[in-house]
Amino acid sequence: LQDPCSNCPAGTFCDNNRNQICSPCPPNSFSSAGGQRTCDICRQCKGVFRTRKECSSTSNAECDCTPGFHCLGAGCSMCEQDCKQGQELTKKGCKDCCFGTFNDQKRGICRPWTNCSLDGKSVLVNGTKERDVVCGPSPADLSPGASSVTPPAPAREPGHSPQ
């Protein structure tokens, strides 16, 4: 015999109190698959969390973080504070980037400046806590009689900070 509950679609639950009739999920609850015997309570985005997607009868609410914070953990289970550019968030709070490192975002960790000499280039613009160095032409290109060159783009694309 087929389980009568298997006919209950997403957004409903199989109500044992009503002869296994498929009943709609009550307000603030959902069922994302068919054949469920209960509906799950919708997630509430409160405090530092804000609603990115409202709960429906078939899917849970989705939260993100209010300005000044960013998501951490599966499904944005936690909010982590933003820091300023030129800083990184450690377990003990926002700390300035050490000399020779930079962070051009409000999240992530400080990364070392590009070593221009590894690509045989010179430093065109010095790095700061907020910006990577800009590599210029190689020293050989700057020797007398060399044709003028347009400084190339930075030696590498900025990496993506860990999320």
């Epitope: 951490l72 450690t90 377990k91 003990k92």
Partner: nanobody, 124 residues
């Protein structure tokens, strides 16, 4: 699959105590440092405490030093947080986290797996 499951949260009066547990599975527990973090209502994540894989080194946030004690039982794959002299400002969801190595790092990015959290409410 790596899993962390916290328990032991609840409602407690100021000055009271609670012991949180975190049951770990899916990895060699003793090989990894572990941490506790918390998120208070309307606030961001705050690191609370960390412990090395062997249990020989422990670290605490200034806000909990002298009141909270982190420990682990590697034979039971379980992490603990003993919380004494609880204050209203300790109210939060507490999360345990696995670190990427046997020693604890300086960053949240050093933690690669988080539990779902257990709620601690300190109120009279």
């Amino acid at each position: 699959e790596v899993q962390l499951l916290e328990s032991g949260g609840g409602l407690v009066q100021p000055g009271g105590s609670l012991r949180l547990s975190c049951a770990a599975s899916g990895f060699t527990f003793s090989s990894y440092a572990m941490s506790w973090g918390r998120q208070a209502p309307g606030k961001g994540l705050e690191w609370v405490s960390s412990i090395s894989g062997s249990g020989g080194s422990t670290y605490y946030a200034d806000s909990v030093k002298g009141r909270f004690t982190i420990s682990r039982d590697n034979s039971k794959n379980t992490l603990y947080l003993q919380m004494n002299s609880l204050r209203a400002e300790d109210t939060a969801v507490y999360y345990c986290a696995k670190e990427k190595t046997g020693t604890t790092g300086d960053y949240y990015y050093d933690m690669d797996v988080w539990g779902q959290g257990t709620t601690v409410t300190v109120s009279s």
